[in-house]
């Protein structure tokens, strides 16, 4: 080890200056007594090194790079050795930005996996290894007073979401939740959410079915469809409202929305449709009147309206 580089900081803001020093020990006797130390950033030679002999006989070269514009580069100090460059030492330099404040933090409670899933947008690329941690605590009130801390949730590399398992949750009690981003240049924190996991519950959609025609019931009128749905059993006791959407299978028509329907309707006659036409239908639900998230749309049901010509004006109505 004839040479050693030390730098003012191995990680800096992109575009900031960086100062490095390369010292060659005196006992490297095979070297030229007055060696000229050269600097190289990546493959490019860097002029401007100031070289001096120190009192102990070692040689030192100091260089200041006015702007480090590479997010990653190797800085090396070297000597001319015959016709080649002999590298004495090299260091990795990194440049980037401190983490921006994570934004758009949102959470949903998945009752099937029994976990609170939170996601966020990390902000612009920092060009540096940046860790994100979902932090939370339990709170009796509106999160002004902090209760028990909850174990940090650390997402897998590259992911901007994390799941807090049920054992760390208290339903019907507020939690303070925020994201902390950290890298070598700094730390930032998102604004804090204060929420009861049940207020961000996302239900599973009901299963749409065609209504089994009963012998005594009149067949559907032209342009009408008789529907029923089976509620998601695990969400049965949650008051909710639902909405249907439908569109003809052929053509470029957009979805038409029908609702709100109370989940308890369970049956519905949808009218005002084109006769003898195949339709695609879906349903989704949301906890209501308490807060919640809309479920995904249900798997599609495909039904055809009857061909008989309508005899009077049709409209939506509940059974």
């Amino acid at each position: 080890e004839c040479g050693h580089i030390s730098v003012s900081a191995p990680i800096v803001h992109l575009g900031d200056p960086i100062t490095a020093s390369c010292i060659i020990k005196q006992n490297c006797s095979h070297l030229d007594p007055e060696p000229q130390i050269l600097w190289r950033l990546g493959a490019e030679l860097q002029p401007g090194g100031r070289q001096q002999r120190l009192s102990d006989g070692t040689q030192e070269s100091i260089i200041t790079l006015p702007h480090l514009n590479h997010t990653q580069a190797f800085l090396s100090c070297a000597l001319n050795w015959g016709n080649s460059l002999q590298i004495l030492d090299q260091v990795e330099l990194r440049a980037g930005y401190p983490p921006a404040i994570p934004h758009n933090l949102s959470c949903l409670m998945n009752l099937t996996t029994s976990s609170l899933i939170c996601q966020w947008e990390p902000g612009p690329e920092t060009h540096l290894p940046t860790s994100f941690t979902l932090k939370s605590f339990k709170s009796r009130g509106n999160c002004q007073t902090q209760g028990d801390s909850i174990l940090d949730c650390v997402p897998k590399d590259g992911q901007s979401h994390c799941s807090i398992p049920r054992k760390h949750l208290l339903l019907y009690q507020n939690m303070g939740i925020w994201v902390q981003a950290e890298n070598a240049l700094g730390t930032s924190m998102s604004p804090q959410l204060c929420l009861d996991p049940m207020d961000v519950v996302k239900l599973e959609p009901p299963m749409l079915r065609t209504m089994d025609p009963s012998p005594e019931a009149a067949p559907p009128q032209a342009g009408c469809l008789q529907l029923s749905w089976e509620p998601w059993q695990a969400g049965l006791h949650i008051n909710q409202k639902c909405e249907l959407r439908h569109k003809p299978q052929r053509g470029e028509a957009s979805w038409a929305l029908v609702g709100p329907l109370p989940l308890e309707a369970l049956q519905y006659e949808l009218c005002g449709l084109l006769p003898a036409t195949a339709y695609t239908l879906q349903i989704r639900c949301i906890r209501w009147p308490l807060p919640g998230h809309w479920s995904d749309w249900s798997p599609s049901l495909e039904l055809r309206t009857t061909e008989r010509a309508p005899t009077h004006h049709h409209h939506h109505h509940h059974h």
Epitope: L111, R166, M198, A265
Partner: antibody, heavy 118, light 107 residues
Framework: EVQLLESGGGLVQPGGSLRLSCAAS????????MGWVRQAPGKGLEWVSS????????PYADSVKGRFTISRDNSKNTLYLQMNSLRAEDTAVYYC???????????WGQGTLVTVSS | DIQMTQSPSSLSASVGDRVTITCRAS??????LNWYQQKPGKAPKLLIY???NLQNGVPSRFSGSGSGTDFTLTISSLQPEDFATYYC?????????FGGGTKVEIK
């Protein structure tokens, strides 16, 4: 304070009918599912039936399906259980209870005893 | 229908003991498992809902754990007022079903 008070229990002959009532107070009755749970003497708990907040959904235990009818009157904050074709095995203390959103029972009434015997 | 199997059906313990009661569902019920305490001549009382949430007013010596098919109610240090019968109940799907009960008696 949430309170549930059952009434209407008593002695009835096999094949007879009885109507149980449960008067609720201390909460917005019309927003909650309600249910009936029974307990035969010296036995465990058995769910009988539940009813959704506005009365449109009414699941029943197989053992009472077709004989019992659950209903509610939200204007009177009252839950009912109409019991027909009663059998000896229906003898039990009948509890009315408020259901939580994820299907737990809390609180419970004090219970009313139904005895089916000749 | 989902069957709930509780064990043991009875146990004897002393004040201060740690007591564990288990409940097994015949199929997966996620976290839809609730625990009740019942004393003779009284209505049941909710202790734990959704597997691990302690109901308001219930002492912290009671705790619940588990998910899927296997669940546990633990009383960390048994108190004189805890001698009672304990029931589990699944609320994943109707019919709602209870375990057979576990009677906790004084040794």
């Amino acid at each position: 304070e949430v309170q549930l008070l059952e009434s209407g229990g008593g002695l009835v002959q096999p094949g007879g009918s009885l109507r149980l009532s449960c008067a609720a107070s201390g909460f917005t009755f019309s927003l909650y599912w309600m249910g009936w749970v029974r307990q035969a003497p010296g036995k465990g708990l058995e769910w009988v039936s539940s009813i959704s907040s506005s009365g449109g959904v009414t699941p029943y235990a197989d053992s009472v399906k077709g004989r019992f009818t659950i209903s509610r009157d939200n204007s009177k904050n009252t839950l009912y259980l109409q019991m027909n074709s009663l059998r000896a095995e229906d003898t039990a203390v009948y509890y009315c209870a408020k259901l939580g959103e994820l299907g737990w029972f809390d609180p419970w009434g004090q219970g009313t005893l139904v005895t089916v015997s000749s | 229908d989902i069957q709930m199997t509780q064990s043991p059906s009875s146990l004897s313990a002393s004040v201060g003991d740690r007591v564990t009661i288990t409940c097994r569902a015949s199929q997966g019920i996620s976290s839809y498992l609730n625990w009740y305490q019942q004393k003779p001549g009284k209505a049941p009382k909710l202790l734990i809902y959704y597997a691990s949430n302690l109901q308001n007013g219930v002492p912290s010596r009671f705790s619940g754990s588990g998910s899927g098919t296997d669940f546990t109610l633990t009383i960390s240090s048994l108190q004189p007022e805890d001698f009672a019968t304990y029931y589990c109940q699944q609320s994943y799907s109707t019919p709602l079903t209870f375990g057979g009960g576990t009677k906790v008696e004084i040794k």
